[in-house]
């Protein structure tokens, strides 16, 4: 399933426009709206940003917010992987990273977030209406997938407000119930909106919550709040998906990861500075495909999953036994 919701980034009107009471009643609906739209903890976020310096260059950042350890991340474009999308990169915490053109650099940013730089020209260049999807797998608990895209009108040179372009897959089991408080809040929100419909709407402002201020940010409400929508699954059509990528399959047999130090697919790429990587603002979260059950253990802290020989917090001595990686 996919559903779309256009929820602009809003700032309350300036205090001078209304009295304190009016200001509070105007702020409240937007707080409630946020609660209603993001009901149920979001699990995956996606950011898509076009670089101002190179219009053909995109940066996709994805992260997983659950407590479980991630066993695989797949980034695709043209739609979700397995539903018309084409794989751009596969990142495994232990067995390394594999990527396909026009992906230039895929890397782990933290234990639970990744980034991918895309660039190209001509047929292999991504375009503004391309949908990018990130799928985080945590075996055996399940997989969570979220998608986002740049709006076609994005101008990287301008400080445009974040444009929500969410795509939500909610076709799987394990949908979380929305709490009664939130349901009440949503009803109350509708009531407030009806009371205030004669008043002018608050002004749209660029979001100032993210330190990076990406040019475009994709996000979607959580699965819980969308479970009843039953929107048909529609794939965004994009004309710039290169035909050459259709033959790129990450599951090409158990040979390409080989052993970490020797195989080209696992060439160490320097530790990811995950401790200092700013996590995107909550407004940029994208929702989950399916949130499932409790996770079977945390992954120990490390700098570059699959790219570091001694990720164990105990240091190199951990390599003495057979359990030395991740």
């Amino acid at each position: 399933m996919r559903t779309e919701a256009q929820v602009p980034a809003l700032q309350p009107p300036e205090p001078g426009l209304e009295g304190a009471m009016g200001h509070r009643t105007l702020v409240l609906p937007w707080v409630l709206l946020t609660l209603c739209v993001t009901a149920g903890t979001p699990e995956v976020w996606v950011q898509v940003r076009m670089e101002a310096t190179e219009l053909s260059s995109f940066t996709i950042r994805c992260g997983f917010l659950g407590s479980g350890s991630i066993s695989l991340v797949t980034v695709s474009w043209g739609g979700p992987n397995g539903a018309g999308g084409t794989t751009l990169a596969v990142l495994h915490p232990e067995r390394g990273i594999r990527q396909w053109a026009p992906a230039r650099q895929a890397r782990w940013e933290t234990q639970s977030s990744i980034s991918l730089i895309l660039e190209g020209s001509g047929a292999s260049s991504p375009c503004a209406n391309t949908t990018f999807c990130c799928k985080f797998a945590s075996f055996p608990e399940g997989s969570w997938e979220a998608c986002g895209s740049l709006p076609p009108s994005s101008d990287p040179g301008l400080s445009a407000p974040p444009t929500p372009a969410p795509i939500l897959r909610a076709d799987l089991a394990g949908i979380l119930g929305v709490s009664g408080v939130l349901l009440f809040g949503c009803v109350y929100l509708l009531h407030l909106l009806r009371r205030h419909k004669h008043r002018p709407a608050p002004r749209l402002q660029p979001s100032r919550t993210s330190p990076q201020a990406p040019r475009a940010r994709a996000w979607a409400p959580s699965q819980a709040s969308q479970a009843a929508l039953h929107v048909p699954y529609a794939t965004i059509n994009t004309s710039c998906r290169p035909a050459t990528l259709d033959t790129a399959h990450p599951h090409g047999g158990p040979s390409w990861w080989a052993s970490l130090p020797t195989h080209a697919a696992h060439r160490p790429q320097g530790p990811a500075a995950w401790a200092s990587t700013p996590i995107p603002a909550r407004g940029s979260f994208v929702s989950v495909e399916n949130g499932l059950y409790a996770q079977a253990g945390e992954r120990p802290p490390h700098t570059g999953p699959g790219l570091t020989l001694f990720p164990d917090p105990r240091g190199p001595r951990a390599m003495e036994g057979p359990l030395g990686v991740r």
């Epitope: 695989l72 232990e94 075996f139 997989s143 599951h251 990861w257 495909e289 499932l292 253990g297 359990l323």
Partner: antibody
Amino acid sequence: EVQLQQSGPVLVKPGASVKMSCEPSGYTFTHYYVNWMRQSHGKSLEWIGVIKPYNGAPSYNQKFKGKATLTVDKSSSKINMELNSLTSEDSAVYYCARSDDFDGYAMDYWGQGTSVTVSS
Amino acid sequence: QIVLTQSPAIMFASPGEKVTMTCSASSSVSYMHWYQQKSGTSPKRCISDTSKLASGVPARFSGSGSGTSYSLTISSMEAEDAATYYCQQWTSNPLTFGSGTKLELK
């Protein structure tokens, strides 16, 4: 060549416990999950649980929590499963199998199975 | 848990005949895997990720489906294909297997 070698058949009395092992070879031990299944005679497969050797953290089918315990023996690179409070219903062939992340977690290699017979 | 129902439970096919068996899930799943098990042996992976042919498996095997309905097809039955076939999902914990379809040579 990838192989998962399981321990031999066992005959135990009701109420007793049994420990069986699965020894992977031919691949990097820490890179793959190892699942355990059971198959009673003439019946389908039941998933018991899975363990990731890198940290020894198991995840169980709720049905087998308290019945099965999955552990990793780091010194011998073996994955063990202990079954307790055995009854005749636990008589079955128990399989270990490797899951491949890059293949949708399909179980691409299986052990030969360990036959457990619970009888007084 | 997600229940996988396979049909038919048992089927007979002549050599060269096209065989299709189905696996129906009680709720939507993202992938389906298929395994072949011959009497007295361990299961062997046939199809993974719904439609990917496992290495060493003949091209006459194919898989398809989405959501709650999946199928395994053998384009031309051969004697060595006689076995029990199981579908398996991992979309939600616990992983579950189908009840199995026993394919016998007619």
